[in-house]
């Protein structure tokens, strides 16, 4: 058992151009706090996957108000360390996520609001009991400087916190075969209870006769390195010179155990010994519980109904994500139609519509004909947010204000001649044709294919088209 400790030194604008705006203002004072999430191994895991090694939240920092016109300085930090206790062995290799959160202290309805300002992540090797390691990470225009270490809690000692120490029974020396516990020279190593031959460097035990392996090691005595990437020789025994073991075919080939689990062969198949926070046949199931406080922003933590979901965060209105860590941007529902711009105002959604569209969701084509009369008896037709006029005969243009040449479209059939007229056009038909557009042939016997011509009009006369 032991504690991972994180000390934040500074959080502020990183070097280079594009300094970030201060997260706080006179109108909206705020304060920072930090969250650290630890996972065993060097796995590339999603930010939302559980913090199987543990998580911690800092205290709130001092309230900060931006000085008008001043660049964002390093922001005031919370006091003290972030401490993540671990119950089992320290895995030696671990992944971390450090989040910087802003608590807004303005006139918030329903209390303060939290928002994620920056998130940094990394994968590191670290021996327990070693000195503080310093680190600098950048997230966008922000820079985070911090130190971290892992230390064992007595009576555990060693790089993995797996060796146990006990007070000396005699003042002068430890019992037979037992060494003093550096750096606690006044204590002695407890008698070994692990399986005989279990690697003192890469193995540990929690019960007598057991040998559990640290990340990167496998085999019954934790003497076999999991990684074989540097082994180029054919399958065979281990090479004493390179320390590289080329495994023979077997159920543990390629280590089927995920998340730092160690594989041991069984008569039929294999067995995974999983680190804390993981279980399942291949250590593929991770389990953070509500006791770890995984829900942010006032999310209610409920224990999952099955091992797959050790907890579920029920998020308050306005937040989402596995840990309620994301503000719901209701604009991601894509509510605005016709290219409208979506604005999530918190209390309501608004769509800012493009020209020619209206309605709460920009769903209506505006009737551009409203108040836009078409001249000279034309009728307005709307469509696609734009209007056009369907003009009466003899007129054209956008608003039917231009006189059109009615003969331009050559409306008279069969060689008839067209004459523009104040009320339209007149066709003078060629011999043998009649009708408004000279469209009807006149029968050879002199009878028309039409009913008798109106009084006063003989077939062949020019006919006016009204």
């Amino acid at each position: 058992a032991g504690v991972f400790e994180l000390q934040i030194h500074s959080f502020g604008p990183g070097p280079g151009p594009g300094a970030p705006r201060s997260p706080c203002s006179a109108r909206l004072p705020c304060r920072l706090f930090f969250r650290v999430c630890l996972k065993p191994g060097l796995s590339e895991e999603a930010a939302e996957s559980p913090c199987a090694l543990g998580a911690a939240l800092s205290a709130r920092g001092p309230v900060y108000t931006e000085q008008p016109g001043a660049p964002a300085p390093d922001l005031p930090l919370p006091d003290g360390l972030l401490q993540v206790p671990f119950r089992d062995a320290w895995p030696g290799t671990f992944s971390f996520i450090i989040e910087t959160w802003r608590e807004e202290l303005g006139d918030q309805i329903g209390g303060p609001a939290w928002s994620l300002l920056a998130r940094v992540a990394g994968r590191r090797r670290l021996a327990a009991g070693g000195p503080w390691a310093r680190d600098i990470q950048r997230a966008g225009a922000w820079e985070l400087r911090f130190s971290y270490r892992a230390r064992c809690e007595p009576p555990a000692v060693g790089t993995a916190c797996t060796r146990l120490c006990r007070p000396r029974s005699a003042p002068s020396r430890c019992g037979p075969g037992l060494r003093p516990c550096a750096p606690l020279e006044d204590e002695c190593e407890a008698p070994l209870v692990c399986r005989a031959g279990c690697s003192p460097e890469h193995g540990f035990c929690e019960q007598p006769g057991e040998c559990r392996c640290l990340e990167g090691w496998t085999g019954p005595l934790c003497t076999v390195p999991v990684s074989t990437s540097s082994c180029l020789s054919p399958r065979g025994p281990s090479s004493a010179t390179t320390g590289c073991l080329v495994p023979g075919p077997g159920p543990c080939d390629g280590n089927p155990c995920a998340n730092g689990g160690s594989c041991s062969e069984t008569p039929r198949s294999f067995e995974c010994t999983c680190p804390r926070g993981f279980y399942g046949l291949r250590c593929e199931v991770s389990g953070v519980t509500c006791a770890d406080g995984p829900c942010f922003n006032g999310g209610l933590c409920v224990g999952g109904a099955d091992p797959d979901s050790a907890y579920i965060c029920h998020c308050p209105p306005g937040f989402q994500g596995s840990n309620c860590e994301k503000r719901v941007d209701r604009c991601s529902l894509q509510p605005c139609r016709n290219g409208g711009l979506c604005l999530d105002l918190g209390h309501a959604l608004r769509c800012r519509c493009r020209a020619g569209f209206a309605g709460p969701r920009c769903e209506h084509d505006l009737d551009d004909c409203a108040g836009r009369a078409c001249a000279n008896g034309g009728t307005c037709v709307e469509g696609g947010g734009a209007h056009r006029c369907s003009c009466a005969l003899g007129f054209g243009g956008r608003d039917c204000r231009e006189r059109a040449d009615p003969c331009a479209a050559r409306p008279c059939a069969h060689g008839g001649r067209c004459y523009a007229h104040f009320s339209g056009l007149v066709c003078a038909c060629a011999p043998g044709y009649m009708g408004a557009r000279c469209e009807f042939p006149v029968h050879p016997d002199g009878a028309s294919a039409l009913p008798a011509a109106p009084p006063g009009l003989r077939p062949g006369d020019p006919q006016r088209y009204l």
Epitope: P317, R330, L333, Q334, R337, R361, E363
Partner: antibody, heavy 117, light 107 residues
Amino acid sequence: QIQLVQSGPELKKPGETVKISCKASGYTFTDYSMHWVKQAPGKGLKWMGWINTHTGEPGYADDFKGRFAFSLETSASTAYLQINNLKNEDTATYFCARYDGYAMDYWGQGTSVTVSS
Amino acid sequence: DIQMTQTTSSLSASLGDRVTISCRASQDISNYLNWYQQKPDGTVKLLIYYTSRLHSGVPSRFSGSGSGTDYSLTISNLELEDIATYFCQQGDMLPWTFGGGTKLEIK
């Protein structure tokens, strides 16, 4: 015309994974979010969440966090629902539906998933 | 979460009848209330959105009304093809929630 066509029925064992598809046609796929709705046998409709078809960002209702994943293949105008580590209680018909800003205006025909050992 | 309650789970009516189905929300949903029809073959269609707006292609015998927490769907002249289950759904607040459904049958 607007259509959402879902993949066929699935029969799975507990612990397995299923991936349901929903192919959209008749409109610009990336202009409308896609939603998923569950209907257990003889029960009502339960909204599972949505995926933004422009950014690919999903949002899940509380009861569907963890084993459920929404995804897209934008080039094929297709949305997917994947359910991992299936359980008997996942037996249901799953619908995809397009959201128009007010309501889910067009629905797929539904995909029946049966989980049985 | 907002609870949606359809108090009548099943309803019998005769062809030509005027039928009203009600739905109540546990809090004000600002008219963001939609009605869906699920036919016996399982297909789901939107009928009414934003309390009273008729979705395209839906017969005008369907209408919706209400405000605040109380809403209703009315079928003015029941036809055989209207035999289905009707669900209300609120779209005001995430997560969206449905009523339990009202099954409409012919007498």
